[in-house]
């Protein structure tokens, strides 16, 4: 279907910005990969770049306001003409679920004391109200709870005394129209306005004061303009050239309000002085290359040595990355394709270990499936050997940092019958349903 095409995609909010216009195909809009599109106004904004995962949304509110509940967040595969990692189509949501607790305890209601005495009537003449109060302490509520009902109640009271009413003016009425709308007529134009003593009228018994001042006023009409001339549009000018060298742009036609020019306060021409059209160069815009994430580090080795594992011998290792997506003469990726570092190999080395503290509770898994659970662990963590943290490999090249690499074999005393990992699991409570927020808005 035709789409609304925008010139910018805001990564932080996922919103389309800078409307170019509507009614174009996705492919025309996406000749420029900096652009973005919406299938309908206010709908999901998809950027034209190749698909990748959006930032995670903020966590939804906790599913319960007290005690332990669960909350969801999501991210979306956004982009055009491709897939996100994991062979996921654009528009697809991925969810995370975690346990939450807004308030440890749940509120408990309290009870009211008896009502106190009535206070005096609120007025000294005519009718008013009187009030009485009670306290929420029988018993007091717990954990932010409250008592049901109101802490005070009111009722009408009558003093049996009549109040006097003093007169007050209502607002002035509008000025009557001048006898002429343009200057230069035979009579001196005047305008008049009046008001009533009715807001309120003064009372008869007991007598109220009348309104002060006059009930009407008059003035001369001054500064009347010469009679106005309405403006009229001239013809549309030529269409401006397409202002872009690739993708879609916006051209403009202009007209002037000079046929005739408005005079003596006559109305300006109705309608727009410019109108825009989408123009299409049909040329795809350059797409710059983007680095993939770094690959795994290669094994830590030293040339001419069979193995340096479990020894205080520094080696070297490298990792690589690929420049992807460069098209239509876009820029190559800046920076290095290969990364080299110095390392000590502790691959499969038996090392003394110690049990870590409990990790924080993990996410609830599966986030949208049945009976999600969360887990935390204590790990048998290896104590790394005290090898020098820097080395000088070549004279005059200075000190280089050395990193431990590999998966050692840590040895800990058994804990709850386990040698490497102790895990504790708990069910997640009050789990909300996974619902696409875009579909909920429809």
């Amino acid at each position: 279907d035709p789409v609304l095409c925008f010139t910018q995609y805001e990564e932080s909010s996922g919103k389309c910005k800078g409307l170019l216009g509507g009614g174009v195909s996705v492919e025309d809009c996406c000749l420029n990969t900096a652009f973005a599109y919406q299938k309908r106004s206010g709908g999901l904004c998809q950027p034209c770049r190749s698909p990748r995962w959006s930032l995670w949304s903020t966590w939804a509110p906790c599913s319960v306001t007290c005690s332990e509940g669960s909350q969801l967040r999501y991210r979306r595969c956004v982009g055009w003409n491709g897939q996100c990692s994991g062979k996921v189509a654009p528009g697809t949501l991925e969810w995370q679920l975690q346990a939450c607790e807004d308030q440890q305890c749940c509120p408990e209601m309290g009870g009211w004391s008896g009502w106190g005495p009535w206070e005096p009537c609120s007025v000294t003449c005519s009718k008013g109200t009187r009030t009485r109060r009670r306290a929420c302490n029988h018993p007091a509520p717990k954990c932010g709870g409250h008592c049901p009902g109101q802490a005070q109640e009111s009722e009408a009271c009558d003093t049996q005394q009549v109040c006097p009413t003093h007169g007050a003016w209502a607002t002035w009425g509008p000025w009557t129209p001048c006898s002429a709308s343009c200057h230069g007529g035979p009579h001196e134009p005047k305008e008049t306005r009046s008001r009533k003593c009715s807001a309120p009228e003064p009372s008869q018994k007991p007598p109220g004061k009348p309104c002060p001042g006059l009930a009407y006023e008059q003035r001369r009409c001054t500064g009347l303009p010469p009679c106005p001339v309405a403006g009229g549009w001239g013809p549309w000018g030529p269409v401006s050239p397409c202002p872009v060298t690739c993708g879609l742009g916006q051209t403009m036609e202009q007209r002037t309000c000079n046929h005739p020019v408005p005079q003596h306060g006559g109305p300006f021409c109705a309608g727009d002085a410019t109108r825009t059209h989408i123009c299409n160069t049909a040329v795809p815009c350059p797409v710059d290359g983007e680095w993939d994430s770094w690959g795994e580090w290669s094994p830590c080795i030293r040339r001419n040595m069979k193995s340096i594992s479990c020894q205080e011998i520094p080696g070297q290792q490298s990792r690589g990355r690929t420049c992807r997506g460069r098209k239509f003469d876009g820029h190559r990726c800046a920076g290095q394709q290969q990364d080299i570092r110095h390392c000590y190999s502790i691959q499969h080395c038996p090392l003394k270990g110690s049990w870590s503290e409990w990790s924080t509770w993990g996410l609830c898994m599966p986030p949208c499936g049945p009976n999600p659970t969360r887990a935390r662990q204590r790990l048998c963590t290896p104590l790394l050997p005290k090898y020098p943290p820097t080395v000088s490999m070549v004279e005059g090249q200075g000190e280089k940092n050395v990193t431990f690499w590999g998966r050692p074999l840590p040895r800990c005393e058994e804990l709850q019958g386990q040698k490497l990992v102790v895990e504790e699991k708990r069910p997640c409570l009050h789990v909300p349903a996974c619902k696409d927020p875009e579909e909920e808005e429809l």
């Epitope: 279907d1 035709p2 609304l4 216009g21 509507g22 009614g23 174009v24 195909s25 492919e27 025309d28 000749l31 106004s41 003409n81 269409v239 397409c242 879609l248 051209t251 059209h277 989408i278 123009c279 299409n280 160069t281 049909a282 040329v283 795809p284 239509f328």
Partner: antibody, heavy 123, light 113 residues
């Protein structure tokens, strides 16, 4: 003058494949999509899909996914359509047509058509 | 898919008379943001490829005689030939380009009475 010159008629056996061409001239080939349309003898028109030679992006009718493959070669200003696993149902005239693009304005109708390639599938 | 239904299937009109061909789509072809109808009309003579007559439902292609006009909006469209000429004998097709797959009407065969 804009022209789309299509390759000649083809007589092919059931199960075989055929690749036809559509050579464009008189405009910038990379700037206009090339659509392909099928017309069985004495019947109406059916859209197969299009290719944008500037980006190599293709869009197919669901009915022709797996049946038709659209490609193009910018250096020779030629678009190609390959039809596979042919049956008698594929016997038809196949047209290529250019997407309309006027004065840089956006449009999607088909303004120039090739003369058509007749494909006959017969044992 | 959007279904395009043309009526009548065939039409015989006297030379110099008005010919009217109708086309109905199964969903609206009017896009609200630009107020354009994504519909074209083509003429096909025997042994020839189709020829574009009208696009955006009512804009005449350059070089097409002004006796051809298109009208309508949303789901109902009309091609009118104000004064039929002998060279107008052909099959006429409407086509939507609102969404993929693009679809054509079944065609209306126009003959001289």
């Amino acid at each position: 003058e804009v022209q789309l010159q299509q390759s000649g008629p083809e007589l092919v056996k059931p199960g075989a494949s055929v690749k036809m061409s559509c050579k464009a001239s008189g405009y910038t080939f990379a700037h206009n999509w090339i659509h392909w349309v099928k017309q069985k003898p004495g019947q109406g028109l059916e859209w197969i899909g299009y290719i944008n030679p500037g980006t190599d992006y293709t869009e197919y009718s669901q009915r022709f996914k797996g049946k038709a493959t659209l490609t193009s070669d910018k250096s020779s200003s030629t678009a190609y359509m390959e039809l596979s696993s042919l049956t008698s149902e594929d016997s038809a005239v196949y047209y290529c047509a250019r997407r309309k693009l006027y004065g840089n304005f956006v449009d999607y109708a088909m303004d120039y058509w090739g003369q058509g390639t007749l494909v006959t599938v017969s044992a | 898919d959007i279904v395009m239904t043309q009526s009548p299937d065939s039409l015989a009109v006297s030379l110099g008379e008005r010919a009217t061909i109708n086309c109905k789509s199964s969903q609206s072809l009017l896009y609200s943001s630009n107020q354009k109808n994504y519909l074209a009309w083509y003429q096909q003579k025997p042994g020839q490829p189709p020829k574009l007559l009208i696009y955006w439902a009512s804009t005449r292609e350059s070089g097409v005689p002004d006796r051809f006009s298109g009208s309508g909006s949303g789901t109902d469209f009309t091609l009118t030939i104000s004064s039929l000429q002998a060279e107008d004998v052909a099959v006429y097709y409407c086509q939507q380009y609102y969404s993929y797959p693009y679809t054509f009407g079944g065609g209306t065969k126009l003959e001289i009475k």
